[in-house]
């Protein structure tokens, strides 16, 4: 809501997640693994990477299966607490300068940094419109302080907050799942809000600091290491 | 395989209360919603409405609020629809049906994919 | 509450006809429209969900297509089997709301 059309291809680390629709967004975090909210759980999924616009075929798209779908052991779906899910492909995207991952953040996001949020959610605050075309938001990082004020006894320190108190700009429906990069890092997942764009409701998400362990191991024992004796 | 099975045929007096059960099988219940559906004989598909398997939030028709209850039991993945004040215009086939769960930011689509046998009410005096 | 208007309300056709049916939304509900189809007795059963897409299982006769408040239902060569009652479902928002349904008779 309130953002841009993204250049194409500039968010190469962006996936769609289809189940016959676009249901969630993702990002793309090795040749062999994707990064996206617990809530976005489905037992069959289909990665879409090198996407731009979803209902066209344009030429860089890599459309790959989900071979393995982990969500975080603790993810609360009441309190949407951990909201972190990792796919596993079933074979390696391929690296160009349109599909590419994005890198793990080396330290937790800092209020007042930029950042970028990507999707393909909802633009509307009331009603529906769900673009064809990926949507670009620039959003600062807000104070924990400021995210405890906006959601009173829901935040918790896996949560973080972006965007404007003031309202009008914010991830929406069917952005989930989806990036929040700064300075290069994957800093946040969409994960929730009350409403989109509303005032003092800024858009809550997870944050993937508190997760490079488990993200780490995860993918260490999910995969096939061949030992030569 | 994927299926819903509900409870059985009831016949209920007016101002009596009726529970349907819907048991489901074949997938992981707290995953997906179920809606209640309803359709008076020779009429049209009327939502009643929705819950969640994985959080019990519920969504209800306006007409029929304060009237329906939904609850769910995920130790046995059945979902049950109370209806009470029952009135000879509840007369119908009550069908459970899955769909997505409504959580955070993913896409709200609320399809329906599968769905019950139907339970006949009806309501006589 | 976003209202379904369903057209036909019946409509008699032969077998190997190309039947359309066309559902409008009050309201923008972008692609969120499912498709049902109904046999006397019988539970509705998915056809197409998001506007578009094919339920696993449905024959390729069956297609769906639009977007915002226009949407359609096609059968491209009708088979015997597909005499029914077809219904519209709005998937975008709460309360759910269904078209009024469309009859394929027997001509």
């Known amino acids: 809501v309130g953002g841009y059309i993204c250049e194409e291809n500039s968010v190469p680390y962006q996936v769609s997640l289809n189940s016959g629709y676009h249901f969630c967004g993702g990002s793309l975090i090795s040749e062999q693994w994707v990064v996206s909210a617990g809530h976005c759980y489905k037992s069959r999924i289909q990665v879409r990477l090198g996407e731009h616009n979803i209902e066209v075929l344009e030429g860089n798209e890599q459309f790959i299966n989900a071979a393995k779908i982990i969500r975080h052991p603790k993810y609360n779906s009441r309190t949407l607490d951990n909201d972190i899910l990792l796919i596993k492909l079933s074979s390696p995207a391929v690296i160009n300068s349109r599909v590419s991952a994005i890198s793990l953040p080396t330290a937790p996001p800092a209020a007042g940094t930029e950042s970028l949020i990507s999707g393909w959610g909802n633009t509307l605050s009331s009603g529906a419109d769900y673009p064809d075309e990926l949507q670009c938001l620039d959003a600062p990082v807000l104070s924990q302080a400021e995210c405890e004020a906006s959601y009173p006894g829901k935040i918790t320190n896996n949560m973080f907050c972006v965007g404007f108190l003031e309202g009008g700009k914010d991830s929406c429906q069917g952005d989930a799942g989806g990036p929040v990069v700064s300075n290069g890092e994957l800093q946040g997942i969409v994960s929730w809000g009350y409403g989109c764009a509303q005032k003092n409701r800024p858009g809550v998400y997870t944050k993937v600091y508190n997760y490079v362990d488990w993200i780490k191991d995860t993918i260490a024992a999910n995969s096939h290491h061949h030992h030569h004796h | 395989q994927v299926q819903l099975v509900q409870s059985g045929a009831e016949v209920k007096k007016p101002g009596a209360s009726v529970k349907v059960s819907c048991k489901a099988s074949g997938y992981t219940f707290t995953d997906y919603a179920i809606s209640w559906v309803r359709q008076a004989p020779g009429q049209g598909l009327e939502w009643m409405g929705w819950?969640?398997?994985?959080?019990?939030?519920?969504n209800y028709a306006q007409k029929l609020q304060g009237r329906v209850t939904m609850t769910t039991d995920t130790s046995t993945s059945t979902a049950y629809m109370e209806l009470r004040s029952l009135r000879s215009d509840d007369t119908a086939v009550y069908y459970c049906?899955?769909?997505?769960?409504?959580?955070?930011?993913?896409?709200?689509?609320?399809?329906?994919?599968?769905w019950g046998q139907g339970t006949t009410v009806t309501v006589s005096s | 509450d976003i209202q379904m208007t369903q057209s036909p309300s019946s409509v008699s056709a032969s077998v190997g006809d190309r039947v359309t049916i066309t559902c409008r939304a009050s309201?923008?509900?972008?692609?969120?429209l499912a498709w049902y189809q109904q046999k006397p007795g019988k539970a509705p059963k998915l056809l197409i969900y998001?506007?578009?897409s094919l339920q696993s299982g449905v024959p390729s006769r069956f297609s769906g297509s639009g977007s915002g408040t226009d949407f359609t239902l096609t059968i491209s060569s009708l088979q015997p089997e597909d005499f029914a009652t077809y219904y519209c479902?709005?998937?975008?928002?709460?309360?759910?709301?269904f078209g009024g349904g469309t009859k394929v008779e027997i001509k």
């Open positions: 309201q923008g509900i972008s692609r969120w």
């Open positions: 998001a506007a578009s």
């Open positions: 819950i969640s398997a994985s959080t019990a939030d519920t």
């Open positions: 479902q709005q998937a975008n928002s709460f309360p759910i709301t």
């Open positions: 049906a899955r769909g997505t769960e409504v959580v955070g930011k993913m896409t709200v689509y609320l399809g329906m994919d599968v």
